[in-house]
């Protein structure tokens, strides 16, 4: 017998869509072999209508697709705009049509109910609103109007013009009688339930001269849209529920077995712990639509998601909903990177952010995830030379190593830098990754002085002490600016005396500024790297002042052994307009990253990357007026 399995019979009506799932053993050969859907002919052949290799028959053009889900061992054939001509015997299979790896499917498309027997058909989605129109003649204008539902053999009164409402419809039905000019009454039913489906009869008058009209109400549960995203990547659920629920609380939930749909996030402030740091619900538009972005996709994120609207912020009977089936592809194009990066207070982290290598010219961004309200991600730095004011001198985004990875360095770490950070670009929105920065106990590895003051016209030498653990690393000094950190010449002064239990492999490397000018004022970093991969950094602020006494200045380490300073920025710092990832690329693919006011605590930092990796690094958090 064939190992392929699927529905043996599919019954539908004209104009509908079907979604046929075929199951196969997910061996590596089966996962990658051709998948097909063919129609069996009278003489035994099977004519391909659609295949996974891109072929689509003219009969299916514009109305069918075939999607393979290799991780699940399934493929799905969607066929829309069904007609009775589609009725017949089909096969879904793997490999070549004539081979035995297939399953027989019988598709029967019957004529839609249409207006048979003067019945008006209403086809409405679950949770939405239907208006059933009921015409009547003049002689019944003043008489009782009513709507009945056929339950088995008996009509049951649903609503009438005398004020009766069936308890099953309480709070969600009304009967409207149009102005005297129109011989029409209508019944509006909101928050439609599956149980509302069925045959209705509206009636004007109660005697033999009454006017009657039949209605067939079909309530459709939305078929889930299939979404297939890469492990470690990102998914966006766009939820458009209509303007009638614009002011109702919105939610995204994930169905577990049974009738439970566990809230992932809602507009009432609830968020599932498993999505902490990697989810944003954008502010909804006036039409009630909203989007939810989830980054750092995990295998366990796969499943059925529903978005909806209900005052409770969770799924209830009558909630209008949209559905998705999320598959997470483990054969991901997005490389593994640490999901947690650890840094010592006063030290630094260097985070590698992946991006789509085909988009090397895209603008790179780094933002700090904030959980307040529905989540937001204010930008901290970009690759075009913008750095949030509070991060000047301690944050840099570098295009290195390139070819699909950029680097973000954050130093002068404090406990307030702990949190979740997102790497993203203005290109492929699926390449958004999340990293959590954790601040751990310990001592920075690099030792630099704290405050350094240089004198105009003199020479300044600033030491940086590198422990022996960095003996094989390249050591450098650079001057920070908002586009990066420009390398400067430095001198190796031999072994350092700053470390206990550290042999001759420790190093003292000095930065020398000759004939200091005002332009030399600013932040300087010393650090280590291996090729284009950056390690720990330490930052020193050099202030420049007028000459007081002649001679060159040689700064010793002793002056700077104070604990890391956790002050927020001085009020004298120049503020520039802040940027936040909120409405921009995270939600509307076509918008550029907008500049919006960000009221976040100025002393926090951020980075993106991803698995657990310890990093140290030294710097002091002293702030100076520019």
């Amino acid at each position: 017998k064939s190992p392929i399995f699927g529905p043996e019979e599919v019954n539908s009506v004209e104009g509908n869509s079907v979604s046929i799932t075929c199951y196969y053993p997910p061996t590596s050969v089966n996962r990658h072999t051709r998948k097909y859907w063919c129609r069996q002919g009278a003489r035994g052949g099977c004519i391909t209508l659609i295949s996974s290799e891109g072929y689509v028959s003219s009969k299916y053009a514009g109305r069918a697709n075939l999607t393979n889900f290799p991780e699940n061992g399934t493929f799905v054939v969607n066929i829309a705009q069904l007609s009775q001509d589609d009725s017949g015997r089909y096969k879904c299979g793997l490999g070549i049509n004539s081979r035995g790896l297939s399953f027989d499917v019988s598709l029967e498309v019957s004529q839609g109910p249409g207006l048979l027997n003067d019945t008006k058909v209403y086809t409405v989605d679950l949770g939405r609103t239907v208006t059933i129109n009921c015409p009547f003649k003049t002689e019944n204008a003043q008489k009782r109007k009513s709507l009945y539902k056929q339950i088995g053999l008996y009509p049951v009164l649903v609503i009438d013009s005398s004020g009766y409402v069936n308890p099953n419809y309480t709070g969600r039905i009304r009967l409207d009688i149009q102005g005297t000019g129109q011989l029409l009454f209508s019944v509006v039913i909101n928050q439609l339930r599956l149980s509302d489906a069925g045959q209705y009869l509206c009636q004007a008058g109660d005697d033999s001269n009454s006017n009657k009209k039949n209605a067939d109400l079909q309530v459709l549960k939305p078929e889930p849209e299939l979404v297939y995203e890469d492990l470690r990547g990102s998914v966006t659920f766009h939820c458009a529920l209509g303007p009638e629920v614009a002011n109702v609380a919105k939610f995204l939930c994930r169905q577990s077995s049974g009738e439970n749909c566990d809230v992932v996030v809602n507009t009432l402030g609830k968020r599932a712990p498993a999505f902490e740091g990697r989810i944003l619900l954008n502010p909804q538009d006036k039409d009630g639509s909203f989007s939810v972005v989830i980054t750092g996709l995990r295998k366990e994120d796969a499943g059925r998601y529903l978005c909806g609207a209900h005052s409770d912020g969770q799924l209830q009977e009558g909630s209008p909903i949209q559905a998705w089936q999320l598959f997470v592809n483990e054969e991901s194009t997005i490389p593994r990177s640490p999901t947690v990066v650890k840094g010592v207070a006063g030290s630094s982290v260097a985070v590698l952010c992946p991006y789509n290598r085909k988009e090397s010219k895209s603008i790179k961004y780094w933002c700090l995830w904030e959980g307040a309200q529905n989540g937001r991600c204010p930008l901290l730095v970009d690759s075009e030379g913008w750095v949030k004011a509070q991060y000047e001198g301690r944050l840099s985004l570098l295009e290195e190593p390139g070819n699909g990875t950029f680097t973000v360095i954050l130093n002068q770490l404090t406990s307030r830098d702990a949190g979740f950070y997102w790497c993203l670009t203005n290109g492929d929105t699926l390449w958004r990754t999340t990293v959590e920065i954790k601040i751990i106990e310990g001592e920075p590895n690099l030792k630099v002085p704290g405050n350094v003051t240089a004198v105009l016209g003199e020479t300044l030498k600033v030491p940086c002490h590198f422990p022996c653990k960095f003996s094989s690393y390249e050591k450098y000094w650079c001057k920070w600016n908002n586009t990066g950190c420009q390398a400067l010449p430095s001198q190796d002064e031999g072994p350092s005396k700053a470390f206990v239990n550290c042999d001759e492999n420790s190093r003292l490397v000095s930065l020398t500024l000759n004939l200091v000018t005002r332009a030399d004022e600013g932040w300087y970093w010393c650090g280590v790297k291996q090729g284009h991969f950056y390690g720990e950094t330490a930052a020193v602020y050099v202030a420049v002042e007028e000459r007081k006494a002649a001679g060159s200045r040689d700064v010793s380490l002793a002056k700077a052994d104070a604990a890391p300073d956790e002050k927020v920025l001085d009020s004298g710092f120049r503020e520039i307009e802040n940027k936040a990832i909120q409405d921009p690329r995270l939600f509307a693919e076509e918008k550029a990253v907008a500049d919006t006011r960000d009221q976040a605590d100025g002393s926090r930092a951020s980075v993106d990357s991803g698995s657990s990796e310890e990093q140290g690094g030294s710097s002091r958090h002293h702030h100076h007026h520019h």
Epitope: F5, E8, T123, S195, Q218, K221, E259, R304
Partner: nanobody, 126 residues
Framework: QVQLVESGGGLVQAGDSLRLSCAAS????????MGWFRQAPGKEREFVAT??????????YYADFVKGRFTISRDNAKNTVYLQMDSLKPEDTAVYYC?????????????????WGQGTQVTVSS
């Protein structure tokens, strides 16, 4: 909660027919599919047939061993699913369970079904 109650089981001769019914009550609004499983003495519970619906479209799935002999159907107005069993064989003897689900991955997988009835005994004598 969804409650499922099976009926229609009994003792029949090989070659005879039986019709099992499964009535669903309670909060049935999220149910996507209902099906039948069976468990013979000393054996694992196994998939028999499932019917899934979406609006006016329905999908029917059958196990290989019942193809052409069993038919699954439903009456939407009564929230009831039926299993018409024809040409019964002694090896069809088992307790038949009705099951319902709000999710549907592989319809053959027991763990896809959240709700189960108590079962009805079908005995086919030779």
């Amino acid at each position: 909660q969804v409650q499922l109650v099976e009926s229609g089981g009994g003792l029949v001769q090989a070659g005879d027919s039986l019709r099992l019914s499964c009535a669903a009550s309670g909060r049935t609004f999220p149910t996507y599919a209902m099906g039948w499983f069976r468990q013979a003495p000393g054996k694992e519970r196994e998939f028999v047939a499932t019917i899934r619906w979406s609006g006016s479209t329905q999908y029917k799935y059958y196990a290989d061993f019942v193809k052409g002999r069993f038919t699954i159907s439903r009456d939407n107005a009564k929230n009831t699913v039926y299993l018409q069993m024809d040409s019964l064989k002694p090896e069809d003897t088992a307790v038949y369970y009705c099951a319902a689900t709000t999710l549907l991955g592989d319809p053959r997988a027991l763990n896809e079904y959240a709700y189960w009835g108590q079962g009805t005994q079908v005995t086919v004598s030779s």
